[in-house]
């Protein structure tokens, strides 16, 4: 029961996290104009991974996409890549974890298969969360660097009394959404990995040893450890007594649930 709950909760937390990562990636407010001493501004600038926007006091908002690929900073490209990798891994992880859920029965899928799928999805969620956190952190670092650089050049004299006020950018809402979402995906992944251990029982799987005696010929089949994972319970230790002698090939083998050739 606890395993099912842990797995289910891990799935839900990861689902929320990945939805958050997608939302953060699509959001325009990765960086917003720093208003420092002026909380009300006539022109407010904010930027996302895909476009930059300007909101005027009039209420008019204009967004322009970055219609260049080569002209964009390498860091921005790296952040985009990390977020997309995070989304793709997360989406695959969600797909895998749906089939791995203990509460959902699909055909005659064994617990070990579900355990493996749970572990796989858990790892995917962890990597997805780390990608998102890394992407957001790289962008945040870029902002901090640019912020202090533009603060140093805050007012550039243009001769006489003319001044150019440089626009400084600070953390936008998308960064916080990304950090939280990445964290949730990471937590969900860890929960899936924990659930995986519970899904796979501890007993070592010993296969039955079959003796077939007929007169003096004894057919002995040591079938015990063929590709066994060591997880799962196979307590069907069957001894087969048959009056007739068999060749080794004729001796029945009872494969474990975990025999993968």
């Amino acid at each position: 029961m606890a395993v099912t709950a842990c797995q289910g909760l891990g799935f839900v937390v990861s689902l929320i996290g990945i939805a958050g990562i997608i939302a953060a990636t699509c959001m325009d407010q990765w960086s917003t104009q720093d208003l420092y001493n002026n909380p009300v501004t006539a022109v407010f600038n904010y930027q996302g991974l895909w476009r930059s926007c300007v909101r005027e006091s009039s209420g008019f908002t204009e967004c322009r996409g970055y219609f260049t690929l080569l002209g964009l900073p390498a860091m921005l490209q790296a952040v985009r890549a990390l977020m997309i990798v995070g989304i793709v891994l997360g989406a695959i992880g969600l797909l895998v974890s749906i089939f791995a859920l203990k509460c959902i029965r699909i055909g005659s899928m064994e617990d070990s298969a579900k355990a493996n799928m749970t572990l796989t999805s858990g790892i995917m969620f962890i990597v997805s969360g780390l990608c998102a956190i890394a992407g957001v952190s790289v962008f945040a670092n870029m902002l901090v660097t640019n912020f202090w650089m533009s603060t140093a050049n805050m007012y550039t004299g243009m001769g006489g009394m003319v001044q150019t006020v440089q626009t400084r950018y600070t953390f936008g809402a998308a960064l916080f959404v990304g950090w939280v979402a990445g964290g949730l995906t990471l937590i969900g992944g860890v929960m899936m990995c924990i659930a995986c251990r519970g899904l796979a029982p501890e007993e070592t799987n010993y296969k039955a040893v079959s003796y077939h005696a007929s007169g003096h010929s004894v057919a002995y089949k040591p079938g015990g450890f063929k590709a066994s994972t060591g997880f799962g319970s196979n307590t069907k230790n069957k001894k087969i007594y048959d009056g007739g002698a068999r060749t080794e090939d004729e001796v029945q083998s009872y494969p474990s649930k975990h025999d993968y050739v």
């Epitope: 930059s52 006091s57 009039s58 008019f60 322009r64 150019t164």
Partner: antibody, heavy 118, light 113 residues
């Protein structure tokens, strides 16, 4: 089309309060945009005074902040200017306007001339 | 506050002539976010409220004759009337639309001979 019309007293005594009304037709003041007051002094110099946002929030010119108040009556689709402790320097033509793209003012009332004199 | 300085303060021209008036701001009105200059030009005929001609420094308001052209960037802006008409007798103002408080230039009075 949006139309604005100012109304109020022509003459105000120094140290008193000046109260003006702007009646808007053709657009609801709660639907969008900022609704501004701008005044023009006798020498043609113009001064932006402040605005009320369609949500009800306000923003004023720092030079007037201590004595200005812009409010509204949504049921009558009107917004108001109150300027306290007036002096003869407040003698001007007062315009109500609505902002548009580029933070520009394409919509103006006809203006109301106010003289501050004892 | 951004100070707007207009020149000349007045000029007299004959109909059909080309007119240029300038507006300088104490700070740049250019916004890098959308590559636009936040400057507006108004025309005020005698006894009337101002009428907006140009916004974003060079975008003509609908219904404004194409003889009015706005140009410039940063701190230096120009309003050009390619062929002055008698009805152009007015005072022309520029406005800082970039930061609060919005400020206006002192105006350029256009008189017709």
């Amino acid at each position: 089309d949006v139309q604005l019309q100012e109304s109020g007293p022509d003459l105000v005594k120094p140290s008193q309060s000046l109260s003006l009304t702007c009646t808007v037709t053709g657009y609801s003041i709660t639907s969008g945009y900022n609704w501004h007051w701008i005044r023009q002094f006798p020498g043609n110099k113009m001064e932006w005074m402040g605005y009320i946002h369609y949500t009800g929030s306000t923003n004023y010119n720092p030079s007037l902040r201590s004595r200005i108040s812009i409010t509204r009556d949504t049921s009558k689709n009107q917004f108001f200017l109150q300027l306290n402790s007036v002096t003869t320097d407040d003698t001007a033509t007062y315009y109500c306007t609505r902002i548009y793209n580029g933070n520009s003012f394409p919509y103006w009332g006809q203006g109301t001339s106010v003289t501050v004199s004892s | 506050d951004i100070v707007m300085t207009q020149s000349p303060s007045s000029l007299t021209v004959t109909p059909g002539e080309k007119v240029t008036m300038t507006c300088k701001s104490s700070q740049s009105l250019f916004n890098s976010g959308n590559q636009k200059n936040y400057l507006t030009w108004y025309q005020q005929r005698p006894g009337q409220p101002p009428k907006m001609l140009i916004y974003w420094a060079s975008t003509r308001e609908s219904g404004v004759p194409d003889r009015f052209t706005g140009s410039g960037s940063g701190t230096d802006f120009t309003l050009t009337i390619s062929s002055v008409q008698a009805e152009d007798l007015a005072v022309f103002y520029c406005q800082n639309a970039y930061s609060f408080p919005y400020t206006f230039g002192g105006g350029t009075k256009l008189e017709i001979k």
